[in-house]
Interface confidence: low
């Protein structure tokens, strides 16, 4: 027991009260047992459950004895202590669960009630196909599903486990952003190590952004106590909110949290597909039955709004499947690993000089045929993870293969004496695959009747929370407004964001004997008089702006300059300040033939007579730099005709690129571009640079790209982007599409190697689209990293395109 | 389709009682609140009050608590608005409405007058 | 209680006219506001619920909006069954109220 708390204290009358007492007096509310601070009688006085959570016809009238759990006594209902199923067995009224579905239009409280009570019922460990076993064994939460708004998956953040994914669903931040990365995690500035278990996480220090019962009580909306004690029974936790929304309105909470740790603890031991799963998802079932006739009860049934939510999926994993680094490196007891289904690896010894993570990676790079896990510097990691700007990330890190677990070495791998592992499920991996999606449910007069929704990620359900409740939400990484239409009603009508800098138009202000670029094409030109009408051809604008910009020019959200540049194929909005365009936009038609380039014109570029020598590339950086060489945003693979060729070779069309993503970056737009656009009638595409040399996964200003490529007059991108944009109805064409589209994007890091693709000594396309695949990812990402705002003039509502813009493609099977 | 349909007018003197009906179809009758709304000659709508046939949990605007009843008898779906005692002030057009947030189906009114 | 301040008490307008009706609240009650339409001799017809919300069939012309203490009924072309008296009613506090009205006449 604490020092600091009379235990000696007494618990009657204050039952799971809402104000949690400080030292040095004794605690009754729900937590007090994990704090090890409840007051004496704690137990025995909050903790009954003597003849059970449910009334039966005997019981019905009974006399009231205080020692019972709930009660079936004549004055129950008055008392709001009633069992959940008081009135079904004892007044004949009918379970909710078998009343019909209602639409409820508008909430329907008692006297008092400000506005619609939220409870949150998260699940751990949900696996969203767990939904498929139906009403035969989850006939409540079915019902809850059927009526009310569902998706068919949510996606938790990586890492898939519980905490991080809790407190992300509670703030709506990245793990990276609100400090809890892991279960487990070391922070070197506390010196100290968080665990599931211990009592450091109590400590606030590790606990960054605003939940929502912070930002509720900020706002002066009262807010149930979000965290149960493992001890404190569901029944019992359900019957406490029960009696939370009896309290008198100035009491009251408006939102209210309960967690089930099952099904996660039976999926661990079982596996998700165990047929002793079937019993514990009963169970969960059993609950939600409980809290929703209790509702009826309360006559809250049509006023409070229920989200039914799960943290993360569950897969199935055996100690069989593990990988142990002793078989890759030779000194595993010099490191520490965060081991299981992702790996993180830092030295086992503080401020260690011989620590070298690159060599590390080195040596678990690409070793074995079979390898089930990649390493990854953490800057490196797909950015779709947002996992990498946090000290207590680990530099390095290991994505396993779904179903394995990675260990230090095999004595690390406990297993019971007959050799049989201790678990059969375990999650945490890639939160893009289909076993770590989990479930979402939101069900009252707010959300929509009968709704099916397309799935998102949970960073998103902060905002819809606080829309629930009438709060402003702390600034948070969810695109608020994304899911309105999720809501019946909205409160929030988001607002698109304020171009900040207008582009320039330049005509023809050079001439080409202004340019000495180092690698011209143009003494290439025949006839010589040719050379004008290509020039010429620059300032003619024509349509292609309806035709290149299918959705608006993309608009700039930070303080520069840059040039709007046509072109009979493209359109480029290029940037004075980086000397490559910070976007190009094309259309590509079905029909769109892929052509071969001539000879002499494959190693040198033309100058734009519109900009500026001093505000273009000049290929003696190329030339002297063997590391590095340029590629073209726009294809030239997919020029309308010979003319419009030399338009690609612009050198306001050229980027610095690597040699090794030159094969990547070549391979999509020679084979892979036209082959969205044959299966998708055609496709528009975007795609740009990148700056995130300090990997926060927001653009880098000027001044920050200063400080990592110092002496080099052209800023090397760290990642390149592409947009691809078609009709969701592919028997539409992409610019003549008058219905809802459809997106896939690619945020492809720009390295020196292909050494993430252990097959890349082979042909591209044995590889390419798998690393592209790899590396999906969402509009909002590429706007974050680039701070331009696509999808600016279209047709559709905002909130529409909002939707569009978190969109993630995950090339994964059906769930 | 939901349907509420009231008793017919009625002519009263001071000091009368009177119990006005409203019958609901077409919905779960026990499971809506029914309110009741008064609108005196020429003048605005005021809430009174309502009930939860379910249980009867009932509950009144300040302005009519204690002066009127509601009540509701589910065996047969229907509602009920009550006065002991009239007086001439009671006259004007009584509706009944369901839900209670938003008064999404009313009654067609009864109209009530009191007079000597 | 919550009392609702309708504005102007009388609107004289024409047929295909805008009209513009305002109800403040004397505390805030968010969203929970409607609107509703009265003919002589009928029953009060739902027209907007939760501030902005058009009830099932009815026109477009009709849209609600605001928050908090101050909102708005705008009918964008007056038609010449709109004109009637239109109510505000709050479903946030206690007991529930309406505003004293508004009446839309031809000018």
């Known amino acids: 027991d604490s020092p600091w708390t009379n235990i000696s204290g007494s618990c009657k009358g204050r039952c799971f009260e809402l104000q949690e007492a400080g030292p040095p007096d004794c605690r009754c509310d729900n937590l007090c047992k994990s704090y090890t601070s409840c007051c004496h009688d704690f137990d025995e006085l909050c903790l009954k459950t003597a003849r059970g959570w449910e009334c039966t016809k005997d019981r019905c009238g009974e006399v009231r004895n205080e020692e019972n759990a709930c009660h079936c006594s004549e004055d129950c209902l008055a008392r709001g202590d009633c069992c959940t199923n008081y009135q079904v067995v004892c007044k004949g009224e009918s379970h909710w669960v078998d009343d019909d579905c209602e639409e409820i239009k508008a909430a329907e409280c008692p006297a008092g009630f400000v506005r619609p009570p939220l409870i949150i019922f998260s699940v751990d460990g949900f696996r969203a196909s767990y939904m498929k076993k139906g009403s035969k064994v989850m006939p409540n939460i079915e019902k809850l599903r059927s009526c009310g708004t569902h998706s068919p998956y949510m996606r938790p953040v990586y890492p898939t486990k519980t905490f991080p994914n809790l407190y992300t669903l509670a703030t709506g931040l990245y793990p990276e952003s609100h400090g809890i990365v892991g279960n487990s995690m070391y922070d070197p500035v506390f010196d100290a190590t968080f665990h599931l278990r211990g009592r450091e996480k109590f400590n606030h220090r590790w606990w960054g952004g605003q939940p929502l019962w912070i930002t509720a009580t900020k706002q002066g909306v009262k807010a149930g106590t979000f965290f149960w004690s493992v001890v404190i029974p569901h029944e019992r936790r359900i019957l406490t909110i029960l009696q939370w929304l009896t309290l008198p309105d100035h009491e009251r909470p408006s939102v209210y949290a309960f967690y089930s740790e099952q099904p996660d603890f039976s999926g661990h031991k079982y596996g998700p597909f165990g047929p002793e799963m079937t019993n514990p998802l009963r169970e969960i079932d059993k609950i939600v039955g409980q809290l929703m006739d209790g509702l009826k009860q309360l006559k809250l049934h049509r006023c409070v709004n229920v989200i039914f939510v799960g943290d993360h999926g569950m897969e199935d994993v055996t100690c069989d499947r593990t990988e142990f680094l002793s078989n890759y490196l030779t000194n595993v007891d010099d490191i520490t690993l965060v081991p299981g289904t992702l790996g993180r690896i830092r030295s086992k010894f503080s401020n260690n000089a011989k620590y070298d993570p690159k060599a590390i990676i080195a040596n678990l790079t690409c070793k074995k045929p079979d390898q089930h896990f990649k390493p990854y510097l953490k800057q490196h990691l797909p950015k779709r993870l947002h996992y990498a700007n946090n000290r207590r990330i680990e530099d390095i890190h290991l994505l396993v293969e779904r179903r394995w677990h990675v260990a230090r070495k095999p004595l690390d791998v406990y297993k019971k004496p007959s050799g049989k592992c201790f678990f059969q499920g375990d999650h945490g991996f890639d939160n893009k695959v289909n076993s770590m999606q989990t479930v979402f449910v939101g069900y009252g007069s707010t959300f929509k009747y009968k709704t099916k929704v397309p799935p998102f990620e949970n960073i998103e359900l902060y905002n819809v929370m606080c829309d629930l409740l009438g709060l402003k939400p702390a600034p948070n990484n969810g695109t608020h407004g994304s899911l309105n239409h999720l809501l019946r009603t909205n409160t929030f009508r988001p607002t698109m964001p304020e171009e900040v800098t207008r582009p320039n138009y330049p005509g023809i202000m050079y001439l080409q004997s202004d340019f000495d670029l180092g690698c011209t094409c143009d003494d290439k030109v025949e006839p010589k008089n040719k050379l004008d009408e290509l020039n010429k051809r620059l300032h003619t604008k024509g349509s292609t702006e309806e035709r290149h910009l299918l959705y608006g020019r993309p608009a700039v959200l930070y303080r520069t300059r840059y040039d709007i540049l046509y072109h009979t194929d493209f359109e480029s909005g290029y940037s004075e300040i980086f000397l490559m365009p910070l976007w190009t936009s094309y259309t590509v038609s079905k029909q769109a033939e892929v052509s071969s380039v001539p000879d002499h014109l494959t190693s040198c570029v033309r100058p734009d007579v519109r900009v500026s020598p001093s505000f273009s590339q000049n290929c003696l950086a190329y030339k002297n730099d063997k590391q590095m060489s340029y590629g073209f945003l726009f294809p030239p693979y997919l020029s309308s005709s010979p003319e419009a060729k030399y338009d690609a070779f612009l050198v306001t069309n050229m980027v610095p690129m690597y040699p090794a993503f030159k094969r990547v970056w070549n391979y999509f737009q020679r084979v892979l571009v036209k082959k969205y656009a044959s299966e998708r009638n055609g496709v528009n595409v975007i795609s740009g640079p990148i700056f995130d040399y300090d990997y926060d996964g927001l653009h880098d200003t000027e001044d920050k790209i200063k400080q990592y490529v110092e002496g080099s007059s052209i800023p090397v991108p760290t990642h390149y982007y592409s947009i691809i944009t078609s009709c969701l109805d592919f028997t539409q064409p992409a610019d003549k599409c008058d219905g809802p589209l459809s997106v896939s994007s690619f945020i492809l890091p720009h390295r020196p190697d292909n050494e993430e693709s252990c097959n890349s000594s082979e042909d591209e396309s044995k590889w390419v689209e798998e690393l592209m695949k790899m590396h999906t990812a969402r509009v909002r990402d590429i706007e974050h990293l680039t701070s331009l705002d696509f999808f600016r003039k279209t047709s559709r509502s905002y909130p529409e395109i909002l939707t569009l813009k978190t969109y993630l493609h995950t090339y994964e099977s059906e769930i | 389709e939901v349907q509420l349909v009231q008793s017919g007018a009625e002519v009263k003197k001071p000091g009368e009682s009177l119990k006005i009906s409203c019958k609901g179809s077409?919905?779960?009758?026990?499971?809506?609140?029914i309110g009741w709304v008064r609108q005196m000659p020429g003048k605005g709508l005021e809430w009174m009050g309502i009930?939860?046939?379910?249980?009867?949990?009932?509950r009144y605007s300040p302005s009519f608590q204690g002066q009127v009843t509601i009540s509701a008898d589910k065996s047969i779906s229907t509602a009920y608005l009550q006065w002991s005692s009239l007086k001439a002030s009671d006259t004007a057009m009584y509706y009944c409405?369901?839900?209670?947030?938003?008064?999404?189906?009313w009654g067609q009114g009864t109209l009530v007058t009191v007079s000597s | 209680e919550i009392v609702l301040t309708q504005s102007p008490a009388t609107l004289s307008l024409s047929p295909g006219e805008r009209a513009t009706l305002s109800c403040r609240a004397s505390q805030s009650v968010a969203d929970s506001l409607a609107w509703y339409q009265q003919k002589p001799g009928q029953a009060p017809r739902l027209l907007i619920y939760?501030?902005?919300n058009r009830a099932t069939g009815i026109p477009a012309r009709f849209s609600g909006s605001g928050s908090g203490t101050d909102f708005t009924l705008t009918i964008s072309s007056l038609e010449p069954e709109d004109f009637a008296v239109y109510y505000c009613q709050q479903s946030n506090g206690w007991p529930r109220t309406f505003g004293q009205g508004t009446k839309v006449e031809i000018k």
């Open positions: 939760k501030a902005s």
């Open positions: 009930i939860y046939p379910g249980d009867s949990d009932t």
């Open positions: 409405a369901r839900p209670y947030g938003t008064f999404d189906y």
């Open positions: 077409g919905y779960s009758f026990t499971s809506y609140w």
